[in-house]
């Protein structure tokens, strides 16, 4: 027989199957060109001295063989005597150590046995009832396939799975979805219902993120408020990178985790927009307001758990930057303007109360007045800061109030509301003898002293009822006692105390009469 032909004679070895565990297996035959065919198989066991024979039986019952020698792959043409247009039965017999080992048989029509393409192009990945669904367009003119997948994680080897039979222009597969680790998938196809047909190559890797994106482990720090009333939010720790399987390392579309920064400005609730979402890489500048910051991780399956931080308000105060004038029509605030066409947000809340009780007012965009000041006025009827108590005021400014990250702090300060001059009058003024010509005057702290920076000083006035002479003594706002000396015994005096702010003179307390008794010597 010619080597290129299938030999229709008895093979050159005895016909007996040893039934041993080793031997040929996994025979695959397919058409490789218009007129050529290839069969290949695996051989289990020691290969030394093994001769392989590809056996073929036609539908007529006639059988032939090709001698492959030690090779486990053999090509032949459509002129080799094998009927390619009709069904044939093929198997391999391996002659080794004086015994014959036989592979399982495959029955197929060689003419139509083409090697399929793997899924090509775009493989769409989605989540379906806790599983992974992959979908792709069937390669043209290859409808009718068996599909397998294999998958691995960064720490596990390949595992094989079955997608089942496919018979449409689109094919799909349900695969396991891991909760917390990324996976690499590959798919392959072969002709449906064709015994012994060859699997395609594996597809390109499909990289799939875990169902839950990793929780971002990041830390923030906030810089000091700068001269421009803004402070930078900086990232102290980058989010941990997802560990990827081997085929997904480098460029792995599909496994990307995106981290977004969600800012919620808690202060100034009357502004138009309170939240803004940014990319984590773009760290924003913030005003001195209080913020909640959340880092949201998400992948192609949606958002995961987020991590939230509270950034407290910057409480650094500027006691002199704000002027307040109280008139009969109402109250006006003045402060150094930031720039042209600025919107200001004035926020106030009673000191010592929950931050949720802040009230605010938004101005229309305004230009500086001739003195370079910005203003905000309100009437007594509005009730704004009308109670006689200490308020914490913060003024924010923005040229683009709709953009959350463009607000800056103009100033933060304290203000005593209502009729501060009367409310601040010191009470419980008492006079005690101190020496032969001096007394000690004490009083209870003014209500204004509860308001940091508001009380400028106390003034103690002493009036000599005989001569009508008056002396005034300034006292530090932190003190509530003064010693009046150079007094004369037997003279009647009255003493009063008032509390002044930077812009208001206080109301005198009720006059307190006293005198130093004349000492009689023995």
């Amino acid at each position: 027989c010619r080597t290129s032909e299938c030999c229709f004679q008895d093979p050159p070895y005895p016909d007996a199957d040893s039934g041993s565990a080793s031997g040929p297996r996994d025979l695959r035959c397919y058409r490789i060109s218009s007129d050529r065919y290839e069969c290949s198989w695996q051989y289990e066991g020691p290969t030394a001295g093994v001769s392989h024979f590809l056996r073929c039986c036609l539908s007529s019952g006639r059988c032939c063989y090709f001698a492959a020698g030690s090779a486990t792959r053999l090509q032949f043409s459509d002129q080799a005597g094998v009927s390619v247009l009709y069904t044939v039965t093929l198997w391999v017999e391996s002659w080794a150590r004086n015994q014959t080992e036989k592979s399982p048989e495959v029955t197929l029509q060689l003419y139509n046995s083409v090697k399929y393409e793997p899924p090509l192009g775009d493989i769409k990945v989605s989540k379906l009832a806790g599983q992974l669904r992959m979908e792709w367009e069937t390669p043209d003119n290859q409808v009718g396939a068996e599909v397998q997948f294999r998958h691995r994680t960064p720490s596990s080897p390949w595992k094989l799975g079955d997608c089942g039979p496919q018979d449409d222009d689109t094919e799909s597969c349900l695969c396991p979805l891991e909760m917390n680790v990324a996976q690499e998938f590959q798919l392959r196809r072969r002709q449906l219902g064709s015994q012994g047909s060859s699997w395609s190559k594996w597809s390109s890797p499909v990289c799939v993120p875990p169902e839950n994106p990793p929780q971002p482990q990041v830390r923030f720090s906030v810089e000091q408020l700068g001269q421009d009333g803004r402070r930078r939010l900086t990232l102290k720790e980058q989010p941990t990178q997802l560990e990827l399987p081997e085929g997904c390392q480098g460029l792995a579309p599909g496994t990307e985790v995106t981290y977004r920064l969600q800012l919620h400005m808690l202060s100034c609730p009357c502004k138009a927009k309170a939240t803004r979402t940014l990319h984590l890489g773009k760290m924003p500048y913030l005003s001195g307001a209080a913020y909640n910051v959340a880092v949201i991780s998400s992948n192609q399956f949606g958002p995961g758990l987020n991590q939230t931080w509270h950034i407290p308000a910057d409480t650094h105060t500027e006691p002199v930057a704000l002027n307040i004038s109280v008139g009969t029509n109402g109250t006006t605030m003045y402060w150094p303007a930031r720039a042209q066409s600025m919107t200001y947000c004035i926020e106030w809340q009673p000191v010592g109360q929950d931050g949720g009780l802040a009230t605010c007012s938004l101005t229309a965009p305004q230009d500086p007045d001739p003195a370079g000041m910005a203003t905000y006025s309100w009437s007594r009827e509005s009730g704004a800061m009308g109670q006689e108590k200490c308020y914490y005021i913060t003024i924010f400014a923005s040229a683009h109030p709709e953009k959350l990250t463009l607000w800056s702090t103009v100033l933060s300060t304290y203000h005593f509301g209502g009729n501060a001059s009367a409310a601040g009058t010191p009470h419980h003024v008492s006079v005690k003898n101190h020496s032969l010509d001096s007394v000690s005057v004490d009083w209870a702290p003014s209500l204004l002293s509860t308001c940091p920076g508001v009380l400028k000083e106390y003034v103690v006035r002493c009036r000599d009822e005989d001569s009508k002479q008056v002396s005034e003594h300034p006292v530090q706002p932190t003190e509530t006692q003064v010693t009046l000396s150079g007094l004369r015994a037997g003279v009647a005096y009255t003493v009063q105390v008032r509390a002044d702010t930077a812009w208001l003179r206080g109301v005198w307390s009720q006059p307190q009469r006293f005198s130093i008794e004349v000492q009689v010597s023995d």
Epitope: R31, S33, S34, L85, Y86, Q109, Y111, N112, V114, Y116, E117, E137, T138, P139, D140, N141, Q142, V143, G144, D169, Q191, L192, G193, S194
Partner: nanobody, 127 residues
Framework: EVQLVESGGGLAQTGGSLTLSCAAS????????MGWFRQIPGKDREPVGE??????????ADSVKGRFTISRANAKNTITMSLQMHSLKSEDTAVYYC??????????????????WGQGTQVTVSS
């Protein structure tokens, strides 16, 4: 459904050439192979050749081998199969039909294994 339309038939001289085309539209991705058959009055349809679309593998009947060539071109939702006929003989005179099959077990010599057919185009070879 798949629709097949042939074109290019006509009169040719002995020894001359002619090219037939077959345009397939509709659910073309599901077609496995397209072939040509011919028929002369009073006789059965006989195979000319076939092409397996995904690979471009061809089959030719012995009577046309070396003279006829089948090729295919794919566009979105349309496949065009061509039959180039050279060294034409008078016995090539027939109505030529384009056919398509969707099954992987079909035999290119058996007309009944093709699900879709064109309306046919006449080829006449005169001396």
């Amino acid at each position: 459904e798949v629709q097949l339309v042939e074109s290019g038939g006509g009169l040719a001289q002995t020894g001359g050439s002619l090219t037939l085309s077959c345009a397939a539209s509709g659910r073309t991705p599901s077609i496995v192979a397209m072939g040509w058959f011919r028929q002369i009055p009073g006789k059965d349809r006989e195979p000319v050749g076939e092409i397996i679309l995904s690979k471009g593998f061809t089959y030719y009947a012995d009577s046309v081998k070396g003279r006829f060539t089948i090729s295919r071109a794919n566009a979105k939702n349309t496949i065009t199969m061509s039959l180039q006929m050279h060294s034409l003989k008078s016995e090539d005179t027939a109505v030529y039909y384009c056919a398509a099959r969707q099954n992987w077990s079909g035999n290119p010599t058996r007309p009944n294994e093709y699900e879709y057919w064109g309306q046919g185009t006449q080829v006449t070879v005169s001396s």
